[in-house]
Amino acid sequence: FNISGCSTKKLLWTYSTRSEEEFVLFCDLPEPQKSHFCHRNRLSPKQVPEHLPFMGSNDLSDVQWYQQPSNGDPLEDIRKSYPHIIQDKCTLHFLTPGVNNSGSYICRPKMIKSPYDVACCVKMILEVKPQTNASCEYSASHKQDLLLGSTGSISCPSLSCQSDAQSPAVTWYKNGKLLSVERSNRIVVDEVYDYHQGTYVCDYTQSDTVSSWTVRAVVQVRTIVGDTKLKPDILDPVEDTLEVELGKPLTISCKARFGFERVFNPVIKWYIKDSDLEWEVSVPEAKSIKSTLKDEIIERNIILEKVTQRDLRRKFVCFVQNSIGNTTQSVQLKEKRG
């Protein structure tokens, strides 16, 4: 189809080589009730109304995306040629950054209901560059966490090194929907709930003497429980002595509860104390037996093939540790009197 009638938009993606980040393009077809653009080819590309990612009920969210090869070849269907690009309704998700994503992307409705609809398309010229600005070493991450129940903020990575006063007007989207009240480079959340989780997009306009570009960044926001302030506690064994039968196999279980940590490296191990000696025992791997938003309960067993007289003189110690500290529980074996 002829793309000369498509409205055009220029976007810039400046990606950090230090982090994994994603990018999105919205099929910025105007809301049908706000403009006749999609039905009559009246407006020149420069007269395109204020865009809104089209998630409307008129099923224009069912769109087709193409890439325009730079060598003038025919348009390519995105879904067939680019595995790292995913189409989700009217949004195109780029899963990996790289200058090879630069190019022209065209979207239009799948259902062309009238001859006028042929001109209902948007051409997006995407330029992708690695970030070179060394002066902004601590720019906001493309993955941001909000602590449930507390106050938090979501920063636009491409503007996080500028003060609020210097910052241009920003357009924010959450999961493809326009957040019309947000215009600053930071969204302040008074109280964080789980519904604040999602994919946020921040756009601002950058102009030079020749043209203007929309600079876009994508932020994945997740809501999290605060990191625990407690060391793990041992739920089992509770008693420090255990009655056993000599010559019989024995399994002693150590179950420990670990509080939530974003960086979670739990330690749960068994060691044996025998007079002045102590050594770690090679036992089966630890397993999570219960997992909730706040705790992880991990179990590790020590298995004795046969309880011996020597085992009665030893202490079996379960040791558990997180980033806050450690806890131990020792068990002394005692022969069962028949």
Epitope: V225, F260, F264, N265, P266, V267, I268, E285, A286, K287, S288, I289, K290, S291, T292, L293, K294, D295, E296, I298, R300
Partner: nanobody
């Protein structure tokens, strides 16, 4: 640093088979559940199959029941997805995930599966 790395994806004809692997590293314990998810172009990510480390029980999406099998080799810290009788609608990016603190929180980078004649 906990990591999951998928492998085994590729292109196959309808009716063919593939076996995906997911190597887990950096874990100091076996998560309660491990799962396989997929995301096809223009669709939400969906859970395909998961396995419990506690009792080995498995669950499958209706669309793959009887065709896909999830298994785990805890000694090798590896999760598998055996995919038989593949259909064009199985084309997607397949992700391996580990359950932690009440959700699948640890994700691999994904491996592409394409089914076409």
């Amino acid at each position: 640093q906990v990591q999951l790395q998928e492998s085994g994806g590729g292109s196959v004809q309808p009716g063919g088979s593939l076996r995906l692997s997911c190597a887990a590293s950096g874990f100091t314990y076996i998560p309660a559940y491990m799962g396989w998810f997929r995301q096809a172009p223009g669709k939400e990510r969906e859970r395909v199959a998961s396995i419990s480390s506690t009792d080995g029980s498995t669950t499958y999406a209706d669309s793959v029941k009887g065709r896909f099998t999830v298994s785990q080799d805890t000694a090798k810290n590896t999760l598998y997805l055996q995919m038989n009788s593949l259909k064009p609608e199985d084309t997607a990016m397949y992700y391996c995930a580990a359950y932690q603190f009440g959700a699948f929180r640890v994700w691999g980078q994904g491996t592409q599966v394409t089914v076409s004649s």
